[in-house]
């Protein structure tokens, strides 16, 4: 398996009750506006064929896409949660900026691309769905990166 380096986050990032609560509240608010319950973004297909040691790198890719293509464009919605959660997630992204994989990451990019394609295909409702799954993103980052 490819070797990942600097793909670690301190567990203290996930032990802050206030921002954890706000992240989950944001996900809940968005999920109430999500009518497409058949489609899942963060689930077994995303992790399929990705070894445990590669998953932080995988989640870094998902986090960066979510920030750039979903949260920034939707930043005026779901207040006041959005204005607090986005900077928090951006800090996590920044801390993972040196997380890389040495070797072939094609299988990871393929899985991430499927997630991106699903969001793009669904348009705005895909963006809402991605926000509604921020709890899953948060927990996936925690499990994969600490």
């Amino acid at each position: 398996a490819p070797i990942s380096s600097h793909c670690r986050l301190d567990k203290s990032n996930f032990q802050q009750p206030y921002i954890t609560n706000r992240t989950f509240m944001l996900a809940k608010e968005a999920s109430l506006a999500d009518n497409n319950t058949d489609v899942r973004l963060i689930g077994e297909k995303l992790f399929h064929g990705v070894s445990m040691s590669e998953r932080c790198y995988l989640m870094k890719q998902v986090l960066n896409f979510t920030l750039e293509e979903v949260l920034f464009p939707q930043s005026d919605r779901f207040q006041p949660y959005m204005q607090e959660v986005v900077p928090f997630l951006a800090r996590l992204s920044n801390r993972l900026s040196t997380c890389h994989i040495e070797g072939d990451d094609l299988h990871i990019q393929r899985n991430v691309q499927k997630l991106k394609d699903t969001v793009k295909k669904l348009g705005e409702s895909g963006e809402i769905k991605a926000i509604g799954e921020l709890d899953l993103l948060f927990m996936s980052l925690r499990n994969a990166c600490i």
Partner: antibody
């Protein structure tokens, strides 16, 4: 064939400890979390926690925090669950089960280990 | 904390359809999984992510969700389907795996 095979039934006295093993085969051990779930007639199923075989990291349900210990041995693809200071109401069938992310469905279960606590 | 409520028992005649429900608070963005447990055996996953079916599980088993209720449906029920059925979700906020109390399916 993907399977989880657990150690045999145990009879323990109150205050004793028990260590249950769960040997995995048929898949890459390090790529799935191993969870422990117990089943009692009174409480039904209770999720106890998981161990990440790749790192040895653990996550315990609040009820079992500071009490249960979950470990793994990569060399023999085996996970362990240890409960010290057993009480009568710890009598249960203890299952190991695997999942992909730490919060996905349990797609494969062990056969269960009956632990009886009795004086 | 999430609490999942199931009916204690459901009875159905062979060849008919059995419906088992699982109700929960704050169900909206949780994914529901269903397990079948025959007497003296370990549970087996029969439905995951509300409605997906693992390979090897007959098409007679299906799952759905509406609001705060998830439903497991078994069509053309057979005697071998008699078992206890449990729903399960992950309560991510409280970091806990939560199970329903179980439903005993009796085939008349």
């Amino acid at each position: 064939e993907v399977q989880l095979v657990q150690s045999g039934a145990e009879v323990k006295k109150p205050g004793a400890s028990v260590k249950v093993s769960c040997q995995a085969s048929g898949y890459t051990f390090s790529d799935y979390y191993i969870h422990w779930v117990r089943q009692t007639p009174g409480q039904g199923f209770e999720w106890m926690g998981w161990v990440n075989p790749d790192t040895g990291g653990t996550r315990y349900a609040q009820k079992f925090q500071g009490w249960v210990t979950m470990t793994r041995d990569m060399s023999n693809t085996t996970a362990y669950m240890e409960l010290p200071r057993l009480r009568d109401d710890d009598t249960a069938v203890y299952y190991c089960a695997r999942d992909l992310t730490g919060f996905d469905p349990f797609d494969i279960w062990g056969q269960g280990t009956l632990v009886t606590v009795s004086s | 904390q999430s609490v999942l409520t199931q009916p204690p028992s459901v009875s159905v005649a062979p060849g008919k359809t059995a419906t088992i429900t699982c109700g929960g608070n704050n169900f909206r963005n949780k994914r529901v999984h269903w397990y079948q447990q025959r007497p003296g055996q370990a549970p087996v996953l029969v439905i995951y992510y509300d409605s997906d079916r693992p390979s090897g599980i007959p098409e007679r088993f299906s799952g759905s969700r509406s609001g705060n209720t998830a439903t497991l449906t078994i069509s053309r029920v057979e005697a071998g389907d008699e078992a206890d059925f449990y729903c399960q979700v992950w309560d991510l906020f409280n970091d806990n795996g939560v199970f329903g109390g179980g439903t005993k399916l009796t085939v008349l």
